[in-house]
Interface confidence: low
């Protein structure tokens, strides 16, 4: 307790380590001969409180006992959690310019004593691993804290390993370095952990286990998958394992999958057949495995092993959708577009597709393979023609799928009635109809088409396509449906060898268009002004146009312009108006209408019509 | 009490190389968790790496802002109370001022993120790299 310096002595009491709450009585002495020079009596002890190095408190209050000149007690309460430094200096009061000159100091501990070690739990990996414990110490106690792991067991076996805790590391993990063997299965071992540090000591409860309990074995290794006759759903899973394991546990998931499939094997010995594999699809084995049926703890998972299933020949129908253009009186160009097959169906790398056009009779057959999802050809236009596609990858090819060749939209009977296009949200239409009222044939399906109406964009993008069935009258259209862009909608209700169709525009979002139309001329025919003009830009249409409209007004005229409303049609440029006065000078400019509002009016024109008024 | 002087910061071409020092005085500190930070003009400061006084137990444990994984590396040497920043495969990106910062835990195997959990700073070194 006693720290000798050269000027004097701090002692401390009861101890320099204290429990939290307690308080400290320091003493600070001179050494015989040490002091002021000439003037004992004005000897004066300070003692100063340091925590991390920074002053906090010059007790000068809290003595409690002084021999002048010589020694003086102080007392010390209300001490903080870990280490406090304190500073007794002594101060020779007859000189004022002299600093206080150091004595000695001692260093206070607070803390707590260790509370019991608890959640004992103990494992060794692998039949070759060696035990080791970890368990929770409780409460920080801010003292250097050793803590012992014992360990007993059969035939007078005992094994201890010790560890300390303090402001810098933390034990609550040893490693006995001994190995249980299997031949120790049925024996129980006990361990309990003791802390002990400067305030008191405690226990833990004793802690009772067997080889099972503890012993996880190590995760498989070296898996591999071997496929039978190179399936693509079958596939024999082998690994290595420890000697003891007797219970495995599989998991395998496609790569993309968020659920695994489990599957448990009893003395698989390393090997396990697989049936339900998807082919050709991306998945991750993963093995796990316990000692003892019942009893024991399951292994980590083992390293996952990647791989991908091969291929086997396609399954599945392909989407057909074709495109008839006359070229002249007898032929006409067919474009056939069809939809890739998901990945559960192409089963593989489609690698070409093979195409037939067949005259009904056989009399001509055109043939063709191709890596493109679309194909045209120029034929007659006489005959009935039917086609056909599939899909083929290395294993083989899909079923053919078929289509006959008619006038889409050659049976008025056959259109569907009532078409209406309502945007749902940003990024989808809800298109609904009514069944064509006199179809002298039944309707095997519909097929709902759309394309942007954008310049060009009958030649430069296939369409997008949806088949329904005959009895539903809706369809939700999503795919490459972007909010502002207005769309072409035909309905098209197909029989064995007729078709119908309606159209109708839509977009899933609108606002007013950015600008109105450019009027380019204006002409004065019979008595009748033609308005000529050039569409809205298509960036700036921002959804379907449904009218565009025509202002004019007296050139100087404070009156209202008045107005003629158009419904819009893509092919029209030019609107006869006929009720303007002769010899009078007017001001005329269109605006264009979608569903959100009118556009800003476009350019002014000014005219002065030269005929007679009607 | 640590206190906290950083050092090594200047200009360098994009790819280039730099290895900041920070150096802490108090003899406790070798039981601060101890991080990295950085503020580009205009921006709010952020993590860019840190390391623990982990004790011999478990060894030292660093964390890394995700944008300097694998080119930045935090170390320390605690018996010449240093800490250092070795930041490879410079961007232009990690243009600021470098900060060193330490906290004290009672639990010290912990690295955290945010500023408000350092207690102690460093004044700073200006990071410039140039494309």
């Known amino acids: 307790n006693i720290d000798v310096c050269k000027l004097g002595t701090v002692t401390v009491q009861p101890a320099p380590v204290i429990p939290l709450g307690s308080a400290a009585n320091i003493s600070c002495s001179l050494n015989p001969k040490q002091g002021c020079s000439h003037y004992p009596s004005s000897n004066e002890l300070i003692l100063l409180k340091f925590v991390n190095d920074v002053l906090v408190e010059n007790l000068h209050g809290k003595k409690v006992h002084d021999h002048t000149g010589h020694s003086s007690t102080f007392q010390v309460t209300n001490l903080s959690l870990g280490m406090t430094l304190f500073v007794c200096k002594l101060n020779c009061s007859n000189s004022q310019k002299k600093p206080p000159v150091p004595v000695c100091g001692v260093e206070i501990s607070v803390g707590v004593a260790p509370e019991p070690p608890q959640n004992i739990s103990c494992v060794q990996e692998g039949e070759n691993g060696t035990v080791a414990c970890s368990w929770n110490s409780g409460k920080v106690t801010y003292l250097k804290t050793n803590y012992t792991l014992q360990l007993s067991g059969p035939n007078n076996l005992t094994c201890q390993k010790q560890c300390f805790s303090d402001n810098r590391q933390n034990c609550n993990r040893l490693d006995l370095g001994i190995n249980l063997s299997p031949d120790l299965a049925e024996s129980r071992f006990i361990v309990r952990v003791t802390a002990i540090n400067d305030l008191g000591n405690s226990s833990s409860l004793p802690h009772t286990f067997t080889f099972l309990d503890i012993v996880i074995p190590l995760p498989p290794w070296d898996i591999r998958i071997n496929f039978l006759n190179a399936s693509g759903s079958r596939g024999t899973l082998q690994w290595e394992d420890e000697g003891q394991v007797v219970l495995n546990q599989l998991r395998y998931q496609p790569l993309n999958s968020t659920s695994w499939n489990m599957v448990n094997a009893t003395n698989a010995k390393g090997k396990y057949d697989l049936r339900d594999l998807r082919p050709f699809t991306e998945y991750e084995f993963q093995i796990s495995s316990k000692l003892h049926l019942s009893g024991g703890s399951w292994s980590n998972w083992s390293e996952s092993l990647r791989t991908r299933t091969p291929e086997e020949e396609p399954v599945g129908i392909l989407d057909i959708w074709y495109m008839k253009q006359d070229i002249d009186y007898d032929r006409q160009q067919i474009s056939l577009f069809w939809k890739s097959l998901n990945p559960s169906e192409a089963r593989g790398k489609i690698l070409h597709y093979q195409v037939t056009l067949q005259e009904v009779t056989k009399k001509t057959t055109l043939q063709n393979t191709t890596r493109h999802t679309s194909w045209t050809r120029v034929i007659p236009r006489t005959g009935a023609w039917t086609a056909s596609v599939s899909a083929a990858n290395s294993k083989g090819a899909s079923a053919p799928t078929h289509i006959n060749i008619v006038d889409l939209c050659g049976t008025g009977l056959l259109a569907p009635h009532q078409v209406s296009a309502k945007s749902e949200n940003m990024d989808n239409i809800l298109v609904t109809w009514q069944p064509p009222k006199k179809a002298d044939s039944a309707v095997r399906e519909y097929i709902v088409e759309w394309r942007a109406l954008q310049p060009g964009s009958i030649t430069k993008f296939p369409p997008h396509w949806l088949r329904i069935p005959p009895d539903n009258m809706s369809a939700l259209i999503s795919e490459n449906i972007k909010p502002y862009i207005c769309y072409e909608i035909r309905v098209h209700a197909l029989s064995e060898s007729q078709g119908g169709c309606s159209s109708i525009r839509g977009d899933s979002k609108h606002k007013a268009p950015v600008s109105g139309p450019h009027i380019t001329a204006i002409t004065e025919k019979k008595e009748r002004l033609f308005i000529s003009w050039t569409h809205i830009p298509f960036p700036e249409q921002r959804g379907c146009i449904l009218h565009y409209r025509i202002y004019w007004k007296e050139r100087d005229s404070t009156a209202q312009p008045e107005l003629c409303e158009i419904q819009y049609r893509r092919s029209q440029n030019s609107h006869p108006i006929s009720s303007l006065q002769p010899r009078v000078t007017y001001v005329l400019w269109m605006t264009a209408v979608t569903a959100a509002g009118e556009s800003p009016q476009g350019n002014e024109r000014e005219f002065c019509p030269q005929g007679k008024a009607n | 009490q640590v206190q906290l002087q950083e050092s090594g910061g200047g200009l360098v071409q994009a790819g280039g190389s730099l290895t900041l020092s920070c150096t802490a005085s108090?003899?406790?500190?070798?039981?601060?968790?101890t991080g990295w930070f950085r503020q580009a003009p205009g921006k709010e400061r952020e993590f860019v790496a840190g390391?623990?006084?982990?004790?011999?137990?478990?060894?030292?444990?660093?964390s890394y802002a995700d944008s300097v994984k694998g080119r930045f590396t935090i170390s320390r040497d605690n018996a010449k109370n240093m800490i250092y920043l070795q930041m490879n495969s410079l961007k232009p990106d990690d243009t600021g001022v470098y900060y060193c910062?330490?906290?004290?835990?009672?639990?010290?195997?912990?690295?955290?993120?945010?500023?408000?959990?350092?207690?102690?700073w460093g004044q700073g070194t200006q990071v410039t790299v140039s494309s």
């Open positions: 108090g003899r406790t500190f070798s039981s601060y968790t």
């Open positions: 910062a330490a906290a004290s835990y009672g639990t010290r195997y912990y690295v955290g993120s945010t500023a408000n959990e350092y207690t102690t």
């Open positions: 390391i623990s006084s982990g004790g011999s137990w478990i060894g030292d444990i660093t």
